[in-house]
């Protein structure tokens, strides 16, 4: 994401087209309060960050309100007046969709349809992962809308489910992030359960696709 300039590595995350988080890791300036300056238009003056992230008492990032901005973010990370990293990036390439909301399960014999609220923008994949205590791996199915039907389930088994949203790489490029997973829900015989016996703890979702 952010090549190194003067040993500065950056990460950009655009949370659900609402908030941009830019974080930096600069070993050379580890005990320095670097400042973050930005603009959304190439012709404007730079503004300074008003919402810094801190790590061990020093600035390590900035949170920006950028609701539905279709812009390039121009930014400069500075040590005093000296720029240590300057770049411009289309924010949308670093999209992280929000976690699925209003997840519902509709059972019909050996199949379940998982639905949730579609996000307001498109070119996304809605992924459902599921497993029973007898499965060694999570199974996965994804669709273009949050309406995913999984067939061939065993009605007697207990299944754990969770859902996430991913940006299509073909459209957004390779640098996006999948959403956080929804809460795990457990079902058996069409009824919700507190847990599935002997289900291993679900692995943490990876950031890479």
């Amino acid at each position: 994401q952010g090549g190194a300039a003067e040993g500065v590595q950056i990460q950009i995350i655009y949370f659900n087209l609402e908030t941009v988080q830019v974080t930096w890791n600069a070993s050379k300036y580890s005990r320095t309060n670097l400042t973050f300056h930005y603009r959304f238009n190439g012709d404007e003056a730079y503004d300074q960050c008003t919402n810094y992230l801190l790590q061990e008492g020093h600035t390590s990032g900035c949170l920006l309100d950028a609701e539905q901005r279709d812009d390039i973010l121009y930014f400069s990370i500075r040590n005093g007046t000296h720029p240590v990293f300057t770049a411009s990036r289309w924010m949308v390439y670093y999209l992280k969709p929000s976690s699925p909301k209003h997840v519902r399960f509709s059972w019909h014999q050996d199949a379940v349809t998982v639905t949730c609220s579609d996000l307001s923008y498109g070119d996304l994949l809605y992924e459902v992962q599921y497993r029973s205590p007898f499965d060694t791996e999570w199974q996965s199915k994804q669709e273009n809308t949050c309406n995913v039907t999984i067939e061939g389930l065993d009605a007697e088994k207990c299944y754990s489910f969770w859902v996430r949203v991913k940006a299509m790489e073909d459209v957004y490029g390779p640098d996006t992030y999948p959403s956080d997973w929804s809460e795990v829900t457990c079902w058996q015989r069409g009824e919700i359960r507190d847990a599935c016996a002997e289900t291993p703890t679900p692995p943490k979702p990876k950031l890479s696709k």
């Epitope: 279709d70 812009d71 949308v92 390439y93 307001s120 923008y121 498109g122 790489e169 459209v171 640098d175």
Partner: antibody
């Protein structure tokens, strides 16, 4: 079929103005970002300007900023480039081109999948 | 500003042979890179986007690879209609083209 047709090119003196048009057909024009790209023998292909689907955002190459204005009329499926204060270095074939990604609630800059045939602009005294 | 550098400027290849074209970015453009083909008197034609995905209708003999700063366009077996100028273009920041590689008949 999907098509872009440029018009409005010609020979013009330095300092004068010219307006290029690009007529689109065969696709939902109002759902795509549209670009102007020019090609000179000396500089090859150079991106000039973009206007997003709804006209909210426009971007320009530094070489034309303040002199060129991109606009569009979605009701007429037409893209425009108003070129003022023309210079000899603006001499080029001008192409309009379509951004590959159809807008579905968010603009995603991409490659150009459809191009017009180009219109020649010559700036000479 | 990102600078895109293509090499070689001219590549002389016999029909049926393999052609390898290089494109280098002055800073990382991730995989946000396209390749175009242009024949004399015609507009550029999109071949590859996302560094490696073939555009609609593009033959399988065209393939792209690379990410970051180094990219390759390979034409596995040159046909007579493939002799043309090829341009790379980054779309990670703005839209910057390379200066082109001319593929001509050896």
């Amino acid at each position: 079929q999907v098509q872009l047709v440029e018009s409005g090119g010609g020979v013009v003196q330095p300092g004068r103005s010219l307006r290029l048009s690009c007529a689109a057909s065969g696709f939902t024009f109002s759902s795509y970002g549209m670009h102007w790209v020019r090609q000179t023998p000396g500089k090859g292909l150079e991106w000039v300007a973009v206007m997003w689907y709804d006209g909210r955002n426009k971007y320009y190459a530094d070489s034309v900023k303040g002199r060129f204005t991109i606009s569009r009329d979605n009701s007429k499926n037409t893209l425009y480039l108003q070129m003022n204060s023309l210079r000899a270095e603006d001499t080029a074939v001008y192409y309009c081109a379509r951004d590959r990604i159809m807008v579905r609630g968010v603009i995603i800059p991409h490659v150009f999948d459809i191009w017009g045939q180009g219109t020649m602009v010559t700036v000479s005294s | 500003e990102i600078v895109m550098t293509q090499s070689p400027a001219t590549l002389s290849v016999s029909p049926g042979e393999r052609a390898t074209l290089s494109c280098r970015a002055s800073q990382s453009v991730s995989s946000n890179l396209g390749w175009y083909q242009q024949k004399p008197g015609q507009a550029p034609r999109l071949l590859i986007y996302g560094a490696s995905t073939r555009a609609t209708g593009i033959p399988a003999r065209f393939s792209g690879s690379g990410s970051g700063t180094e990219f390759i366009l390979t034409i596995s077996s040159l046909q007579s209609e493939d002799f043309a100028v090829y341009y790379c273009q980054e779309y990670n920041n703005w839209w910057t083209f390379g200066q082109g590689t001319k593929v001509d008949i050896k």
